[in-house]
Every structure is written in structure tokens, then in C-alpha cells.
């Protein structure tokens, strides 16, 4: 459309704006009980862990962001049984970690979840 | 807990995953006519915003991250009427932009919300 | 480094269109804003409009609704049409970028006269 | 508009001299985000624009440092500490802050 009235510099910061909000991996704090499906007496600490999601805006409203790469990461976290019949242990957990990510249209699409040890 | 069979360097990384995850402004991207409540004959270029929102998490499924103060940023935005009547109108949207959250219980409360102009 | 080239005709006549194209080496549009600027005789320099990457244009209102820039992404140019010319639009015809900092690469210019 | 007016026309120098032109804008072009957006651009014959110096005071790439410029507001000065032969040419202003945007009238810097 025609700019009748706005100069580079302005257009600019909207620019850099526009790019920051794109789909893209974000840093993303992810519940891990809730994640994994574990019954309710089983509690992880820390209760969340950090991962880079898809997160961002499409500029279709028939699109959303979705991952198109995915890499797994370790994270070791205390598993905790309730009542507290033995020590906490150090369990490995790996945690879903976007990579890639890409305006898609909303068709059905199972999302990617954690993989537990 | 007891730790008995964890070594210190082993903690720590937990422990600074941990900090990561806790409640606290995170810089999140924002549909801005959704959040303004727009008629669907209006668009904004760019759609989306960034700001910062309280998120991560509470170590009590009682408590949610909530934010405690709240500033108001101005974003500089096209504004669309469709059909394209008039050039794109550039329009301050002025966006909540939260700058302390907290752990609070999970009583009702009327979320912040973006004040227009 | 960024390269720019005008192409086009060196002869047009008076109320006919004037059409330009810039190609744009060692650049992709998916950044930065793409200007036209003209050097009348008598060293006298004009900012003419420019079009975004996004296709948002501006046109210097002296010129109200005779000129039109457009662009072809998957080419890496971008037009200017200048139209219902006159002997006042015999000029020196520039294409530039303006990236981080304003009017930083310029193409090389073509001379364009209006006469009959 | 913003008229942008430069000081002198024409200028003549020796090699070696000092070379001083001054651009003055009609009202202030310090742009609404606190930069002021005022480039100077030196045309060689039968060359393109070249920039020199962008947002008053900035060398842009390439650009021998005896080259300089300084201002605020209204009034801007491009220096040339000494001048050289490959300097000679045409020395234009621009401001990049108000469309639309607008150059200054050109200095013609010359041998004596």
C-alpha cells in the first residue's frame, strides 16, 4: 500500500517489530508433570524446565506456527514419589526442543511431546 | 530433601534451571486485535507485538504466576479497514507491558489488557 | 557488496510514460528500501519515492499521481514509471538503496531526455 | 518541505587546504526516534553519489577520516582536513528525516 505519509526510519522500528514477532523458536517454560502424563502422586523438581518452542505470529489467520525440526535435550530433574517412601532420585528426562519452525496451515497435526528416559 | 548421593556441580545445574523457570516478565508475543477486541473488518500490520507478560512457574499447583505492576508501552502500528477505503492509517496502540510478577492463588481476577490510544 | 543498475530508455517523448528498471546484485528484497532519485541538468538533486521489501511505497507528493514504483522479488528489480512526461523530466535517473543507513549504495544513473 | 541550503556554491582549494561547507535546514530534522538523519554525499565527474557521512557525524565505510562532520538542529558542517585531487566533485547534503526527504543545492569543490 501507499505510504503517503511515513518515512523509512519509521517504517524501521515497525520493521524490526514485525521481525521479532515472527514464528519462531522461543524459550519456553514447560510444565513436566503435566507433559509427560505422570499420575498425581509423582512430582518432578524443579516442577518446569526450559525449551525453545514455536512461538510467534503467522500473518494468515489460516496459518499457524508449527515445528518442522526437533531435537531431543536431557534434562536431570528429581522424581519425587508421594508419601515420600524412599530418596528422590536423578532421573534423565528428555525434553522435546524445536529447532525449526514454519507458518502452516491449521490442518490437525499431532504435536510433538516430551520422551520420557 | 536430602540430597545424599548428588554432587554439588550436579545441583547447581538444577538449581539454575530452576531459576530460569520461576514466575517473572518473559517477552511474549501479543495478537494485538484479539487483545484490543477489534471488529473483524480491522487488521494491524504487524499483527502481533512484542511485550513482556508474566510467565513460568509456581512451586504450588494452588499459586499462578500473576503480575504485580504494569507499565504501558506505546507501539507505533498500521491500522487496516476493510474494505480499503483510506490509506493505512499509522495509530500509537498502547500495550500492557508487565514489569513484576508474583505467585498469588488462583482467585478470579480480571487479566490486564491493552488501553487504545 | 551491494551492486545496482538503471536500465532503460535514453529517449522518450513529451506525455508518453517513462519506464525504468534498477537489478539488484549481491541484495535480496527481503530487507531494506529501494529509492529513486533524479539529477537535473544544473546539478539540482530529487527524491522521487521509494518501495519496501514488504511493497509499501512513497511518492514525493511534486510529483502527485504520475509516478508509480513496483518491484519483481523474484527478479530483484524494482520499476519507476513516470507518466505524461515533459521536458522538465529530462534528468539523470538514480536507483538507490537506503539499508542501515540512508542512501548508502547508488546505481550508476542513466540519462533519460524528454523531446519530441 | 525542508529546504536544505549549502554554503558556498563553489568552492576552490589548493592540495593540502583546510575545506569547510555548511548546510543549513529550514527547521530542525532531528527525527521523532532522537536521530538526526543528515548525510552528505560527494558526486566525482561522471560518477554516482557516494556517501561520506551519515547521521551528522558518521564515516561511512571506506571513508578516509579526513573527512569529518558535525552539527545539531539547523546547522551542519562537512570538513575536509586536507584535501586531496581524488576529492574533488560535487558535495551534496540530504536530510533523511522528513519526507520528503530533501537535498541541499551541491557545492562544487574545485582546484584554483
Known amino acids: 500500500f501507499a505510504a503517503t505519509f511515513y518515512d523509512i526510519e519509521t517504517l524501521k522500528v515497525i520493521d524490526e517489530e514485525w521481525q521479532r514477532t515472527q514464528c519462531s523458536p522461543r524459550e519456553t517454560c514447560v510444565e513436566v508433570a503435566s507433559e509427560l502424563g505422570k499420575s498425581t502422586n509423582t512430582f518432578f523438581k524443579p516442577p518446569c524446565v526450559n525449551v525453545f518452542r514455536c512461538g510467534g505470529c503467522c500473518n494468515e489467520e489460516s496459518l499457524i506456527c508449527m515445528n518442522t525440526s526437533t531435537s531431543y535435550i536431557s534434562k536431570q530433574l528429581f522424581e519425587i514419589s508421594v508419601p515420600l517412601t524412599s530418596v528422590p532420585e536423578l532421573v534423565p528426562v528428555k525434553v522435546a526442543n524445536h529447532t525449526g519452525c514454519k507458518c502452516l496451515p491449521t490442518a490437525p497435526r499431532h504435536p510433538y511431546s516430551i520422551i520420557r528416559r | 530433601f536430602a540430597a545424599t548421593f548428588y554432587d554439588i556441580e550436579t545441583l547447581k545445574v538444577i538449581d539454575e534451571e530452576w531459576q530460569r523457570t520461576q514466575c517473572s516478565p518473559r517477552e511474549t508475543c501479543v495478537e494485538v486485535a484479539s487483545e484490543l477486541g477489534k471488529s473483524t473488518n480491522t487488521f494491524f500490520k504487524p499483527p502481533c507485538v512484542n511485550v513482556f507478560r508474566c510467565g513460568g512457574c509456581c512451586n504450588e499447583e494452588s499459586l499462578i504466576c500473576m503480575n504485580t505492576s504494569t507499565s504501558y508501552i506505546s507501539k507505533q502500528l498500521f491500522e487496516i479497514s476493510v474494505p480499503l477505503t483510506s490509506v493505512p492509517e499509522l495509530v500509537p496502540v498502547k500495550v500492557a507491558n508487565h514489569t513484576g510478577c508474583k505467585c498469588l492463588p488462583t482467585a478470579p481476577r480480571h487479566p490486564y489488557s491493552i488501553i487504545r490510544r | 557488496e551491494v551492486q545496482l543498475q538503471e536500465s532503460g530508455p535514453s529517449l522518450v517523448k513529451p506525455s508518453q510514460t517513462l519506464s525504468l528498471t534498477c537489478s539488484v546484485t549481491g541484495d535480496s528484497f527481503t530487507s531494506d528500501y529501494w529509492n529513486w532519485i533524479r539529477k537535473f541538468p544544473g546539478n539540482r538533486l530529487e527524491y522521487m519515492g521509494y518501495i519496501s521489501y514488504r511493497g509499501v511505497t512513497y511518492y514525493n507528493p511534486s510529483l502527485k499521481s504520475r509516478i508509480s514504483i513496483t518491484r519483481d522479488t523474484s527478479k530483484n528489480q524494482y520499476y519507476l514509471q513516470l507518466n505524461s512526461v515533459t521536458t522538465e523530466d529530462t534528468a539523470t535517473y538514480y536507483c538507490a538503496r537506503w539499508g542501515t543507513v540512508p542512501l548508502d549504495y547508488w546505481g550508476q544513473g542513466t540519462s533519460v531526455t524528454v523531446s519530441s | 518541505d525542508v529546504l536544505m541550503t549549502q554554503t558556498p556554491l563553489s568552492l576552490p582549494v589548493s592540495l593540502g587546504d583546510q575545506a569547510s561547507i555548511s548546510c543549513r535546514s529550514s527547521?530542525?530534522?532531528?527525527?521523532?526516534?532522537?536521530?538526526?538523519?543528515l548525510e552528505w554525499y560527494l558526486q566525482k565527474p561522471g560518477q554516482s553519489p557516494k556517501l561520506l557521512i551519515y547521521?551528522?557525524?558518521n564515516r561511512f565505510s571506506g571513508v578516509p577520516d579526513r573527512f569529518s562532520g558535525s552539527g545539531s538542529g539547523t546547522d551542519f558542517t562537512l570538513k575536509i582536513s586536507r584535501v586531496e585531487a581524488e576529492d574533488l566533485g560535487v558535495y551534496y547534503c540530504?536530510?533523511?528525516?522528513?519526507?520528503?526527504?530533501?537535498f541541499g543545492g551541491g557545492t562544487k569543490l574545485e582546484m584554483k
Open positions: 547521521k551528522v557525524s
Open positions: 527547521q530542525s530534522i532531528v527525527h521523532s526516534n532522537g536521530n538526526t538523519y
Open positions: 540530504f536530510q533523511g528525516s522528513h519526507i520528503p526527504y530533501t
